[in-house]
Amino acid sequence: EPHSLRYNLTVLSWDGSVQSGFLAEVHLDGQPFLRYDRQKCRAKPQGQWAEDVLGNKTWDRETRDLTGNGKDLRMTLAHIKDQKEGLHSLQEIRVCEIHEDNSTRSSQHFYYDGELFLSQNVETEEWTVPQSSRAQTLAMNVRNFLKEDAMKTKTHYHAMHADCLQELRRYLESSVVLRRRVPPMVNVTRSEASEGNITVTCRASSFYPRNITLTWRQDGVSLSHDTQQWGDVLPDGNGTYQTWVATRICQGEEQRFTCYMEHSGNHSTHPVPSGKVLVLQSHW
């Protein structure tokens, strides 16, 4: 998977008046990394692992960047003409990626009241707008404003892209991100399904990086894809990930099944507990 940095900023308006604050979150490699603390007006690391990325360096640069981005987005919201009464939001999501072959990608997306209305591929300078008339109107509105604003030239977008990549590379220089390996905790549980059947679930949690293989085997051989149900690989809030795989088996057949896990070159297999024993937990 590519390394990525994702900025998510939101500004709000009430009865046509743009509010002073903004919400901001930054994700590094899909993990919550930074957020903007509105009380302290500072960028704050999300959790210990994020603090470890920069060690004892300050977060001044991140604070300055987020504050500037928030200000820009507030100005953009002020120029949206069709603001009706009540609460409205403008959200900007910016993503830059560095792939294994060192190629880079960068994109920017705008949402109004949670609805996507404008996207840009920064490398190709292509803008795309969804079909709906509301999206078309909003996109025209915003693009006109961005064109008027001398700052928002092609060079500006490329500079923004370059800044994002520079920050991403700076974070990646930290061995915490590049060499971080947290092995999963794997546990197998069983639950009654229907008469004579049970559902066995294999859960992997607290692992990093995100890539993992988790599959059920019967008599040592992997079950076909369509007999297993997989959960998404999701952040668990601690800078690590979690996922699961489940399958339905006949009661009494537990001894024929194992959950196979492979992560960062390590592997383990986990049997199904029989009978009354409900959970078998292991950490390799």
Epitope: V221, G252, Q255
Partner: antibody
């Protein structure tokens, strides 16, 4: 730690019956099946089959159907191999081995030597 | 039944040598292969499962590889305690079948 301890050597005559035991230590007996494996003198290993220690259901390889019987005493965490109507060709060392996921023999007993004389 | 063949029934090597033991299956077994070690006193131990995955506690000088019908076990730096007979076993199909074994001796 995990251990499988088998009963001692047996000297039998043709036509007799033998019952070999395999006692498990260090794990939940009913979570793993038990395999039985035969090794004739100077020969390789031959899988005889396995018994599901949770349901008690045995599975026999084709060459071991008929005179061979797997059984359990779950309360004592013990599996048994019984061979009826013994023949000279039953002379061998018999191993029990824990059945992990029904594909792996991850822990083995020390083996029980059976000698059948005519 | 799937026949497992270990063509070399005995092998002589010196301490410190790199030794490779081979095993071939009568049909493709999709890497569903395990390796076991039997010491001269008869004690049997699992070494490798699924062609190349080392069982816990097995020294890293042991490694496994192969695909299709051809598989091998390599000991990178032969030590005195490696003197034993080595068996491969397939679990692609029932019945489970073992190779005839390769006896490793010191020169």
């Amino acid at each position: 730690q995990i251990q499988l301890v088998q009963s001692g050597p047996e000297l039998k005559k043709s036509g007799e019956t033998v019952k070999i035991s395999c006692k498990a230590f260090g794990y939940t007996f009913t979570n793993y099946g038990m395999n039985w494996v035969k090794q004739a003198p100077g020969k390789g290993l031959k899988w005889m089959g396995w018994i599901n220690t949770y349901t008690g259901e045995p599975t026999y390889a084709d060459d071991f159907k008929g005179r061979f019987a797997f059984s359990l005493e779950t309360s004592a965490s013990t599996a048994y191999l019984q061979i009826n109507h013994l023949k000279n060709e039953d002379t061998a060392t018999y191993f029990c081995a824990r059945n992990y996921g029904n594909y792996l023999f991850d822990y083995w007993g020390q083996g029980t030597t059976l000698t059948v004389s005519s | 039944d799937i026949q497992m063949t270990q063509t070399t029934s005995s092998l002589s090597a010196s301490l410190g040598d790199r030794v490779t033991i081979s095993c071939s299956a009568s049909q493709g077994i999709s890497n569903y292969l395990n390796w076991y070690q039997q010491k001269p006193d008869g004690t049997l131990k699992l070494l490798i499962q699924y062609t190349s995955l080392l069982h816990s506690g097995v020294p890293s000088r042991f490694s496994g590889s192969g695909s299709g019908t051809e598989y091998s076990l390599t000991i990178s730096n032969l030590e005195p305690e490696d003197i034993a007979t080595y068996f491969c076993q397939q679990y692609s199909k029932f019945p489970r079948t073992f190779g005839g074994g390769t006896k490793l001796e010191i020169k």
